[in-house]
């Protein structure tokens, strides 16, 4: 039995933690019965042969955030009980062959945030019990065939934030137990057909922030258990018709920030667990009938910041559970009166920043639960009589930045607005654009020198003191539709949300982390 080294703290001898810049070598002597050893934030630059020879009972070894750049091949000799080894956040450029030999119990190996430029099949050939391998945040440019062939029990593999330009279709073929595969923030331009065919138990696949242009038609056809698929911030210009047809378990899918021009009907196969779909920041020009008809449980659909000029009347068929629809910042000039007819549960709709010149009187006819409608910054001169009369839950309506024509025809709308001012918000009110003599005057208080026709004005329901849906002007468009000011670099795309470091990837959402996997 050895005492605790002076540079370290020991908890009943079994847990040893050594930290501090004054440490330049592995402290000795270490307690022979130590089960956990952490060497953090030191100035250790290398590991010699067998520095841990006398602590064979060790189960967890963390050597993180040091100046470590060289490791001798026998550094981890005699650690047959070791289950967890982290060398993350060091300065390793190469790993000696045989470094992990003899680590028969090793289950988790963290090599993330180093400067590794290559890995070889021989590196991991002895790690047959490995379940988790973290290689993200290195300088890997390619993965050789066979690199992971011996890791048949691997369940989690993170290769994110490297410099991978291509992936061999054979590299993952033996990883039948893999459940999480992360390839985000690389330079992948395409994924060969068959790359994921052997991953029959895959549940999460992260491919965001690459340069992928085309997806092979059957790329995911063997991944029936896939639940999370991240494809955002790539260069995908089209989706093969059957690409998502066999992903019944999918509950998270991101496609924003691509170059999609069109979506074919039924492109999204049955996905009963998908609740939110983000398609913003693409180049979509039109939406055909039944394009989302399989997404029966979808609650949020974000189509903002595209180039949509035409929406077929049946485009939103099947979306009976949809609560939030974002169509803002597109090129819409007109809408069919039945386009929203099937959206019986819709609560929030965003149509701002389009070119809408008029709205059909029945546009919101079946959408009785609407709470917010964003129509600002369009080309509207008037609105049909009674267009909002049946919307008893409406508590936010934005109509400013439209060229309202304040002649006698505007009076019904003016009178309705007069009785419903609280719904318009206080930030910006709609103002007249024509005739010229009233330009800039508030539409609500304008005095039109014409006899006011008799119009039916509905009774205004009372609302709780807090508006259910306030105006919010700056949050990410991942789920937001009320926002007019949005982040152009979506926060949720593995910066798990593009300019933020992986170690800070939770910061936009306020998330903090010590490790990322």
């Amino acid at each position: 039995y050895y005492g605790c080294p002076s540079e370290c703290t020991c908890s009943r001898a079994s847990q040893v933690e050594c930290t501090g810049a004054r440490i330049v070598a592995v402290p000795t002597p270490l307690p022979w019965n130590a089960m956990s050893l952490q060497i953090l934030n030191t100035h250790i630059t290398e590991l010699s042969e067998s520095p841990f020879l006398n602590i064979s009972a060790l189960i967890a070894l963390r050597i993180e955030k040091n100046e470590l750049s060289h490791i001798m091949p026998g550094a981890f000799r005699n650690l047959g009980s070791l289950r967890y080894l982290s060398l993350a956040n060091n300065k390793l450029q190469v790993l000696p062959i045989g470094l992990f030999q003899g680590l028969d119990s090793l289950e988790s190996l963290l090599l993330s945030s180093n400067q590794l430029v290559q890995i070889q099949p021989a590196h991991f050939s002895q790690c047959s019990n490995l379940k988790e391998l973290q290689l993200h945040g290195n300088h890997l440019e390619y993965i050789p065939d066979g690199a992971f062939d011996h890791l048949v029990g691997l369940t989690k593999l993170n290769l994110g934030k490297n410099s991978l330009t291509h992936i061999s279709p054979r590299v993952f073929q033996h990883l039948g137990n893999l459940q999480v595969l992360r390839l985000y923030e690389n330079r992948l331009t395409d994924i060969p057909m068959g790359t994921f065919d052997g991953l029959v138990n895959l549940q999460e696949l992260a491919l965001q922030q690459n340069q992928i242009g085309l997806l092979s038609p059957g790329l995911f056809h063997n991944n029936h258990n896939l639940q999370r698929l991240y494809l955002s911030n790539n260069h995908i210009s089209q989706l093969p018709p059957s690409i998502f047809m066999q992903l019944p378990q999918l509950n998270r899918l991101t496609l924003f920030g691509n170059s999609l021009k069109e979506l074919s009907p039924g492109i999204f196969g049955p996905m009963p667990n998908l609740r939110e779909l983000w398609l913003y920041d693409n180049h979509i020009t039109s939406l055909p009938d039944n394009v989302f008809s399989n997404l029966r449980q979808l609650q949020v659909l974000i189509l903002s910041r595209n180039q949509i000029s035409f929406i077929s009347p049946g485009a939103f068929n099947g979306l009976t559970e949809l609560r939030e629809l974002s169509l803002h910042t597109n090129a819409l000039q007109d809408l069919d009166g039945n386009v929203f007819r099937m959206l019986a549960n819709l609560q929030n709709i965003s149509l701002q920043n389009n070119r809408l010149r008029q709205l059909p009187g029945n546009i919101f006819a079946n959408v009785n639960g609407l709470m917010t409608i964003q129509l600002q910054n369009n080309q509207l001169e008037n609105l049909p009589l009674g267009i909002f009369d049946h919307l008893g839950k409406l508590c936010e309506l934005r109509l400013y930045d439209n060229p309202w024509r304040c002649d006698s025809d505007i009076l019904p709308l003016r009178n309705w607005l007069l009785l419903n001012q609280p719904r318009l918000g206080t930030d910006t009110v709609p103002v007249c654009f024509s005739p010229a003599n009233v330009r800039g005057q508030s539409l609500i208080i304008i005095n039109v020198n014409v006899a006011v026709p008799s119009v039916h004005v509905p009774e205004v329901p009372s609302y709780p003191e807090t508006s259910w849906y306030p105006d919010t002007s700056s949050y990410p468009d991942t789920t937001s539709i009320s926002s007019t000011t949005e982040l152009t670099s979506p926060v949720e795309d593995y910066t798990d949300l593009t300019t933020i470091q992986v170690t800070d990837d939770r910061s936009v959402w306020g998330m903090t982390q010590a490790q990322s996997g």
């Epitope: 639940q227 789920t479 959402w509």
Partner: antibody
Framework: QVQLVESGGGLVKPGGSLRLSCAAS????????MSWIRQAPRKGLEWVSS????????YYADSVKGRFSISRDNAKNSLYLQMNSLRAEDTAVYYC???????????????WGQGTMVTVSS | DIVMTQSPSSLSASVGDRVTITCRAS??????LAWYQQKPGKAPKILIY???SLESGVPSRFSGSGSGTDFTLTISSLLPEDFVTYYC?????????FGPGTKVEIK
């Protein structure tokens, strides 16, 4: 500092109603999904409801669906839970929590309020 | 709904002991799992997210592992303040169910 403070709890008869509030401070409220979680006396935690940052996506546990309504007012940095048709089994401490979601799948409730007690009894 | 089970429901240990708590999901949940610690009369506190990532500020004696259906929380060397209750929670699909909890008691 980042903080969540619940209020509105109290004693209510079965069939009655109560409205809980959660005041958020120290972070950009409109960036975050929010949730309510409850804990009956001497029992475990039970997720009750979640709401997306803009309020468009709303999710409920089956045990409260149709009776409880979650909402938020981003201008007031506030989260609400309207509880109707209350039952004895709804008696619990109700916590509001910041749901830290992001595109990488790093999910967790990272900030919790101190809780407010709701007692349903005749 | 995904059912989360925890074992053991309670355990007795001594200061300095290494303890492992297991959480099992009724179906695969990728790595969408978090671990919380709750002290009596207090709100829960996040320890681990993404199954194995340590939340900032949480002591490194806590670690998590697993993916799919089987997960573990390990406390490498118990301190007096660790004798409380621990919960796992899945975030893979709604409802975001919790495990029933594991109470760590002093032997």
């Amino acid at each position: 500092q980042v903080q969540l403070v619940e209020s509105g709890g109290g004693l209510v008869k079965p069939g009655g109603s109560l409205r809980l509030s959660c005041a958020a401070s120290g972070f950009t409220f409109s960036d975050y999904y929010m949730s309510w979680i409850r804990q009956a006396p001497r029992k475990g935690l039970e997720w009750v409801s979640s709401i997306s940052n803009s309020g468009g996506a709303i999710y409920y546990a089956d045990s409260v669906k149709g009776r409880f309504s979650i909402s938020r007012d981003n201008a007031k940095n506030s989260l609400y839970l309207q509880m109707n048709s209350l039952r004895a089994e709804d008696t619990a401490v109700y916590y509001c929590a910041r749901y830290n979601w992001n595109d990488r799948g790093y999910d967790a409730f990272d900030i919790w309020g101190q809780g407010t007690m709701v007692t349903v009894s005749s | 709904d995904i059912v989360m089970t925890q074992s053991p429901s309670s355990l007795s240990a001594s200061v300095g002991d290494r303890v492992t708590i297991t959480c099992r999901a009724s179906q695969g949940i990728s790595s969408a799992l978090a671990w919380y610690q709750q002290k009596p009369g207090k709100a829960p506190k996040i320890l681990i997210y993404d199954a194995s990532s340590l939340e900032s500020g949480v002591p490194s004696r806590f670690s998590g592992s697993g993916s799919g259906t089987d997960f573990t929380l390990t406390i490498s060397s118990l301190l007096p303040e660790d004798f409380v209750t621990y919960y796992c929670q899945q975030f893979n699909s709604y409802p975001h169910t919790f495990g029933p909890g594991t109470k760590v008691e002093i032997k």
